[in-house]
């Protein structure tokens, strides 16, 4: 399906295309000799980059900082220095830059202020950079000032104190709404979440906090959960992790109804050295992965129903550090149903999984052809791809990226791997899919850093290297062929690939800085490759391409969660621009329901090998531990629940006995009866 | 074939620090792998003393953390061994070796043939 | 720390008889142990890991048996130059910790 990569070869050669890459190269060099830099991008499709410098000198009683602030408007090609729109202050960089939600154009920055201060001191910008006000705030900021996803206007702050501090009007006046606070949250609806301690701080009431909520603003409040050790949202589920009466396990609850009512998760609980963690969700379902007793630096991930309530066994030691908190848990957004992780084997082997269908079967990624089993495969003619993410990075192992995937580049994984029985410590190459990770081909030779520019009509890489660097590569088909570009004749020490989050622009920021003997100046270049790809892409460049097609002569070839979906796909011997405007188009079709379109419900189970569901032995005529608030006709099953975001119609409908099982329900959860609401005086 | 070689002084006075340098040849350092020291007291058993990755991250044994840095120099395709305020209990045979090729474990596949280092004043 | 016991620590065995050598862990090491083989004045050579699994060029005498906390090294029929000191070593948990050795001697 694919070769072997090949470099400046008569692979596809581009025809001039270094004096066309020559003629769109900027270089930027900043009068600075900061330590350190960091960049953001501000709005979509705007061009505005904010470039923050800081230069920190330790003396022995106070730290001198100086910032400097730079503005772009042209994707990186030009920079201006600013800083005298923040009347040259030092920023603190542990806060970052907080950038608006959307295209609202709006930027904070937090600055230093001296010790004896009454608060803190913020610049705030609402025309994406252009111009700054210095507001000074009543309390000293813990964490970054925290937008609400539906109004750009308000925001929320912790203070040093623990207060919840909330702002309606961009961060020009602030309220205090609460006091002893530990975590605060959005919600929807511009929803305050937040959990309070009651008698002596937030480490010490761990497991006693209180659950608060607030729908306007800090006027009224409602006590939506007690004995709570934390929350967290995640899709349209909130989840509690809550104390038990009895002793010091914990256990989640579940609420669809932001804290109405709360139903307990049917998954085991917890004890005190465990945790929960919520690996990823969506308004359809959550990947929830359960801690294993003990320090083995794996658990269990669990799959959830429509309810986030009921929850399948999905994989098996699943490596997550309770050190670091490392997992590998990796969801592949340019294929629906695809995520990569990695499970701790018994001999502390770790070894790359896949699933394609949202965790309901995982298996190891195939072998990329032509591909040899390194050292760690025992048969050298059997073995597997494994990858390399945050473990591996965690691990100072040479890998300079985690897996890079993007919505708008259909089918395309980029990733660091070994192929063998295991993840190896030899130094890995790059390794690409174009169909979302069925297939996989070595893509470069060695660690990379790498980007997806035009929705992935370029795919561009730098090498990682210790030595300076002044070349980049660059492919125009999904990583076959590549050439190389000499960007700069001075070799710059490589600090970061910078491109618009979205991965549609055509501009790649190469970032880095020259050292002589005494000075470090900071550099970047910035390439565009619209000239590379001269032409907009027509109708005649692109092909269909069934998503997750395993077996072509099958009617169900293509039907993952109970649809197919086509794709139009750019070839790879097309060389033209899809376009900032680019929309992936995708032919969905509905396919015919089976019993794999179905989890089993509440009380439920499918024996190992079977596809029928039945009833648990152990709950015949008993009562069940997990339960569900709210109406009753919740609590009828026939056994079978659709799996949630399954579209599947016709077909196989499994009918069975309607059974009422609100006789078999127990639970001592907060009852929405004791909820009390509250009115902030 | 890999082949590895311990050097340095063999003979150290007390509270002063032992220095071993480990050259490898035959394959290069920064292509990865881990790479240990283990040492062993004159008619005693192996005890392992700690292990690094070519990027520089370590693992000590806990026994010896406060003592010990191990260092890798990927230029010279060699890795090194600093252990301070010897006494003469870390009078031993020192050996450098290669670790396995998965992430996670850590036994010795490949053995430098030891150099002995004697502590006495 | 994991203590690996290995016992016996002396074992006399006469050529092309059967060598069984024991190691014991104070926690389960699952099968995250190693075999190693040490002659006078040598460094040690590497027979087993994974509990099992010979490594390259190990003659096919040798093998390794167990998990968790019982661990067996066979060596089905002895050779001259199987006369040695053999450590088992676990790398299930740091510290790496090695056994104190068998020493098997001619009878």
């Known amino acids: 399906r694919r070769g072997a990569p090949a470099e400046d070869q008569d692979c596809g050669r581009l025809p001039d295309f270094i004096a066309k890459l020559t003629n769109n190269t900027h270089q930027h060099v900043f009068d600075d000799l900061s330590g350190s830099v960091s960049l953001s991008w501000v709005g979509d499709s705007t061009g505005v980059i904010l470039v923050l410098t800081t230069f920190q000198v330790p003396l022995v009683i106070v730290s001198f900082g100086q910032s400097k602030l730079y503005r772009s408007e042209d994707y990186g090609k030009n920079f201006k220095d600013i800083t005298n729109l923040i009347n040259n202050t030092f920023i603190r960089t542990e806060f970052g830059m907080a950038i608006g939600p959307e295209n609202s154009g709006k930027v904070i920055l937090t600055a230093e202020v001296s010790g004896g201060s009454r608060g803190g001191r913020v610049f705030r910008s609402s025309d994406f950079a252009k111009n700054f006000v210095q507001t000074d705030l009543p309390f000293h900021p813990l964490t970054q000032m925290m937008y609400s996803p539906q109004n750009s206007d308000y925001l929320l702050a912790l203070s040093t104190e623990n207060g919840l501090w909330v702002s309606k009007n961009f961060g020009e006046k602030w309220e205090e709404i609460h006091k002893a606070v530990c975590l605060a949250k959005w919600g929807p609806n511009n929803i305050i979440f937040f959990t309070t301690h009651v008698n002596g701080s937030c480490k010490a009431d761990l497991g006693a906090l209180e659950l608060w909520r607030t729908s306007d603003l800090g006027k009224t409040f409602k006590t939506i959960g007690v004995k709570i050790y934390s929350f967290g949202l995640g899709g349209r589920f909130l989840f509690a992790s809550v104390m038990a009466d009895k002793d010091t396990t914990r256990r989640i609850h579940v609420s669809t109804d932001q804290g109405d009512t709360w139903s307990m998760a049917q998954l085991p609980s917890v004890g005190q050295e465990q945790f929960y963690s919520i690996l990823a969700a969506n308004e359809d379902m959550v990947f929830m992965h359960v801690d294993e007793p003990g320090d083995t630096g794996f658990g269990t991930i669990f799959t959830s129903d429509d309810r986030g309530i009921v929850y399948s066994k999905s994989l098996d030691r699943h490596l997550y550090t309770t050190t670091g908190g490392e997992t590998d848990f990796t969801n592949v957004t340019s294929l629906r149903g695809v995520y990569i992780t990695s499970t701790l084997s018994e001999d502390n082997s770790i070894q790359s999984m896949i699933t394609f269908d949202q965790g309901g079967r995982w298996e190891h990624l195939r072998k990329p052809e032509n591909s040899k089993c390194d050292a760690t495969a025992k048969n050298k003619n059997e073995c597997s791809l494994h990858i390399h993410a945050s473990y591996s990075i965690s691990q100072k192992l040479n890998v300079p990226m985690a897996p890079l995937s993007e919505p708008n580049a259909v089918g395309i994984v980029i990733a660091h791997g070994s192929v063998g029985d295991a993840i190896s410590v030899m130094v890995p190459d790059v390794y690409i899919s174009d169909d979302g990770g069925y297939s996989w081909a070595k893509m470069l030779e060695g660690p990379h850093y790498y980007t997806i520019l035009d929705s992935g009509g370029i795919i561009v890489a730098i090498e990682h290297s210790n030595r300076p660097i002044n070349v980049i590569k660059f492919s125009t088909d999904e990583g076959q062929c590549w050439q190389s570009y000499v960007f700069t004749q001075e070799p710059i020490y490589f600090t970061g690939l910078a491109s618009e989050p979205g991965a549609r622009s055509m501009n790649i920021s190469i970032w880095g800085f020259t050292e002589s003997f005494i000075t470090r100046q900071w550099v970047s270049y910035t390439v565009d490759f619209k000239d590379i790809l001269e032409r907009n892409c027509e109708e005649d460049d692109y092909t269909t391409w069934l998503a997750h097609s395993t077996d072509p002569g099958d009617y169900k070839d293509g039907c993952i969660l109970g649809y197919k979906e086509q794709f139009l796909r750019l070839r790879k011997s097309s060389v033209c621009q899809n376009g900032r405007d680019y929309v992936v188009a995708k032919q969905p079709s509905v396919c015919p329901c089976s019993l794999e379109d179905f989890l089993c419900d509440f009380g439920y189970f499918r024996p190992e090998n079977a596809s029928e569901c039945v009833e648990q032995p152990e709950l015949k005529g008993h009562e069940l531990e997990f339960c569900l608030y709210g109406k009753e006709e919740h609590l009828t099953t026939n056994g079978y629940r659709k799996i949630p975001g399954d579209k599947c119609q016709g077909g196989m409908n499994p009918a069975r006995e309607v059974k009422d099982l609100k006789k078999k329900c127990t639970s001592n959860f907060l009852n929405p009866t004791k909820q009390n609401s509250k009115s902030n005086s | 074939q890999v082949q590895l070689q311990e050097s340095g002084p063999g003979l150290v006075k007390p509270s002063e620090t032992l220095s071993l340098t480990c050259a490898v040849s035959?394959?290069?350092?920064?292509?990865?792998?881990?790479w240990g020291w283990i040492r062993q007291p004159p008619g005693k058993g192996l005890e392992w003393i700690g292990s690094i990755y070519h990027s520089g991250n370590t693992y000590y044994n806990p026994s010896l953390k406060s003592r010990v840095t191990i260092s890798v120099d990927t230029s010279k395709n060699q890795f090194s061994l600093k252990l301070s305020s010897v006494t003469a209990a870390d009078t031993a045979v020192y050996y450098c070796a290669r670790g396995p090729p998965e992430l996670g474990k850590m036994y010795f596949q490949h053995w430098g043939q030891g150099t002995l280092v004697t502590v006495s004043s | 720390e994991i203590v690996l016991t290995q016992s016996p620590a002396t074992l006399s065995v006469s050529p092309g008889e059967r060598a069984t050598l024991s190691c014991r862990a104070s926690q389960s090491v699952s099968s995250n142990l190693a075999w190693y083989q040490q002659k006078p004045g040598q460094a040690p050579r590497l027979l087993i890991y994974g509990a099992s699994t010979r490594a390259t060029g190990i003659p096919a005498r040798f093998s390794g048996s167990g998990s968790g906390t019982e661990f067996t090294l066979t060596i089905s029929s002895l050779q001259s130059e199987d006369f040695a000191v053999y450590y088992c070593q676990q790398d299930r948990k740091g510290p790496l910790t090695f056994g104190g050795g068998t020493k098997v001697e001619i009878k």
């Open positions: 035959g394959y290069s350092i920064s292509s990865g792998y881990y």
